[in-house]
Amino acid sequence: SGVFQLQLQEFINERGVLASGRPCEPGCRTFFRVCLKHFQAVVSPGPCTFGTVSTPVLGTNSFAVRDDSSGGGRNPLQLPFNFTWPGTFSLIIEAWHAPGDDLRPEALPPDALISKIAIQGSLAVGQNWLLDEQTSTLTRLRYSYRVICSDNYYGDNCSRLCKKRNDHFGHYVCQPDGNLSCLPGWTGEYCQQPICLSGCHEQNGYCSKPAECLCRPGWQGRLCNECIPHNGCRHGTCSTPWQCTCDEGWGGLFCDQDLNYCTHHSPCKNGATCSNSGQRSYTCTCRPGYTGVDCELELSECDSNPCRNGGSCKDQEDGYHCLCPPGYYGLHCEHSTLSCADSPCFNGGSCRERNQGANYACECPPNFTGSNCEKKVDRCTSNPCANGGQCLNRGPSRMCRCRPGFTGTYCELHVSDCARNPCAHGGTCHDLENGLMCTCPAGFSGRRCEVRTSIDACASSPCFNRATCYTDLSTDTFVCNCPYGFVGSRCEFPVGLPPSFPW
């Protein structure tokens, strides 16, 4: 579809005569008839197969034609066609005299013709005007012409329909040849596919408009290149979606179980050495002079009554010192300078000579001890507290301070951690030295069987086309990560195949 345009520029009829030579009265009121037809080697009368157009009266005798004539005429003249431009044509231009206002052919006498020109040739579609001048004995006509495509038609012969558009069926303008030229940010045969944000991951990201990057399930980040770890993952990371790979020192399904309590909490005091002994479990090895589960208690070395024979004990920075009573010496006042003659045995103890009187030994009554029966019996010396309990003298009696997990007068009873039924979902409880352990039924895990173990939704290999399957543990479902070229929740559909038309 296009338009043959004819621009009349100047008509010269100096003598004001008709083709017959007869003059016009009072002058030649001139209008034009144009006939456009298919190419003929010799232009002959017949149907104007490409179209016809007439002008109003444009002037008298000799005149120039303005670009857009008044009186309803148009210059250039338009001869539209609704077919492929063949590249060749024949053109007939007739100048007529109009004695009255009726310009219809049947209303004019045959001898009203002023002049007739006929040309033919090749003409390519284009914006440039071809200038021509035709001269007869009495007249001269100067004109130009061209063929241009109608709006939305393109190509060498105006046969390609193309309408620029900017909606979801295409974002493009039309090139001179009728091919599509995508608007910035769009691609594809019909420019309907957006160009995603630069760097947007090919498989894990997509977009619905240019410079966007929307993430497929299991991925996050500006470029959709960061996996989303399992929901609830505390101290872990992932390399593929829904994973929870624990950081060092953490364990469990959600990496929320502390396997390195020593580093994370530093429970041991006073420079003690900490050893991890299980989940949230540790042992402190105390430096000399300290005691307690966390070595939080300062130990007085005089508490063990190291001084013998009534010596008095003094705590010192680096240990202790015994102040001995008269007649005794040594680190613990263990050596005597006395004999039985000095009555060294207290509290009714009886003295026995030894080494020909050079030494002696006291035989103490019940409840007294010491080399001179000077001490009441320390009920803790026999280490009566079992399971690492700490013995404390309390006047005439003694008391055991038990370690966690033990009870009874002598810490001889193991506290059953299982007594309060800590294992959930029917788990079986086992007492251990350092706590308890739950044996979980199928489908549950965790320290207390509190975690519902996800069924492996990937076990049935639901993903097609070599896609990678991930189990979404929070919903017991699977997510397929598609290889390039496939889409669908199971990656079952190829992308970008040529459309299959129904005809």
């Epitope: 309408k163 620029k164 558009r165 900017n166 594809g188 019909y190 669908g488 559909f493 190829p494 459309p499």
Partner: antibody, heavy 121, light 106 residues
Framework: EVQLQESGPGLVKPSETLSLTCTVS??????????WGWIRQPPGKGLEWIGD???????YYNPSLKSRVTISVDTSKNQFSLKLSSVTAADTAVYYC?????????????WGQGTLVTVSS | SYELTQPPSVSVSPGQTASITCSGQ??????ASWYQQKPGQSPVLVIY???KRPSGIPERFSGSNSGDTATLTISGTQPMDEADYYC?????????FGYGTKVTVL
């Protein structure tokens, strides 16, 4: 041969939500050459375009219905769905699903047979 | 909102030419499609991109579109062509249908 089949309840109460599903067979809903649309026709009246969806999930709605319409796609089932909330008697119509072809300038070359939805208490 | 206007009805004798117009602002700058719908049936695409015919559509159906008017022409109309005809175009991202024209073959 591509075929489209609408399914869903034929009777919906006023103020409730109308829900329809279109199942596509004989072709993939994930083709980049097509959008998948919903059109309705009240009894004795003309056609009204409701909206459409691309396989990626991009949606386009008629501005006059936008506040009430949701269209979604399930590529694994080769289906797309329509939800129209807060319905009134004026929403009584035959609802069609159709394939809109990008190579045809957006012309709908395949249609479902249509399903009549009546809004009445 | 964008509107497409069609005459409510067109009557034609068998064998004659029926022309249905569809008017909208600058419609010639958009692609027009035409659908035929017979009673109790789904619409059928008969013309797309102004003047192209899908396979299986008879040659007697033709279309044109320029200025503000698209036209569907049925040459040598047959009784089986009696139906409702709808024009359709896209305004930005919204599909718009004409009000429909009932073609009666006398």
């Amino acid at each position: 041969e591509v075929q489209l089949q609408e399914s869903g309840p034929g009777l919906v109460k006023p103020s409730e939500t109308l829900s329809l599903t279109c199942t596509v067979s004989g072709g993939s809903i994930s083709s980049s050459s097509y959008y998948w649309g919903w059109i309705r026709q009240p009894p004795g009246k003309g056609l009204e375009w409701i909206g459409d969806i691309y396989y990626t999930g991009s949606t386009y709605y008629n501005p006059s219905l936008k506040s009430r319409v949701t269209i979604s796609v399930d590529t694994s089932k080769n289906q797309f769905s329509l939800k129209l909330s807060s319905v009134t008697a004026a929403d009584t119509a035959v609802y069609y699903c159709a394939r809109e072809a990008v190579p045809l300038g957006g012309g709908s070359d395949y249609w479902g047979q249509g399903t009549l939805v009546t809004v009445s208490s | 909102s964008y509107e497409l206007t069609q005459p409510p009805s067109v009557s034609v004798s068998p064998g004659q030419t029926a022309s249905i117009t569809c008017s909208g602002q600058r419609l010639g700058d958009k692609y027009a499609s035409w659908y035929q719908q017979k009673p109790g049936q789904s619409p059928v695409l008969v013309i797309y991109e102004d003047s192209k015919r899908p396979s299986g559509i008879p040659e007697r159906f033709s279309g044109s579109n320029s200025g503000d008017t698209a036209t569907l022409t049925i040459s040598g109309t047959q009784p089986m062509d009696e139906a409702d005809y709808y024009c359709q175009a896209w305004d930005r991202d919204t599909g718009v249908f004409g009000y429909g024209t009932k073609v009666t073959v006398l």
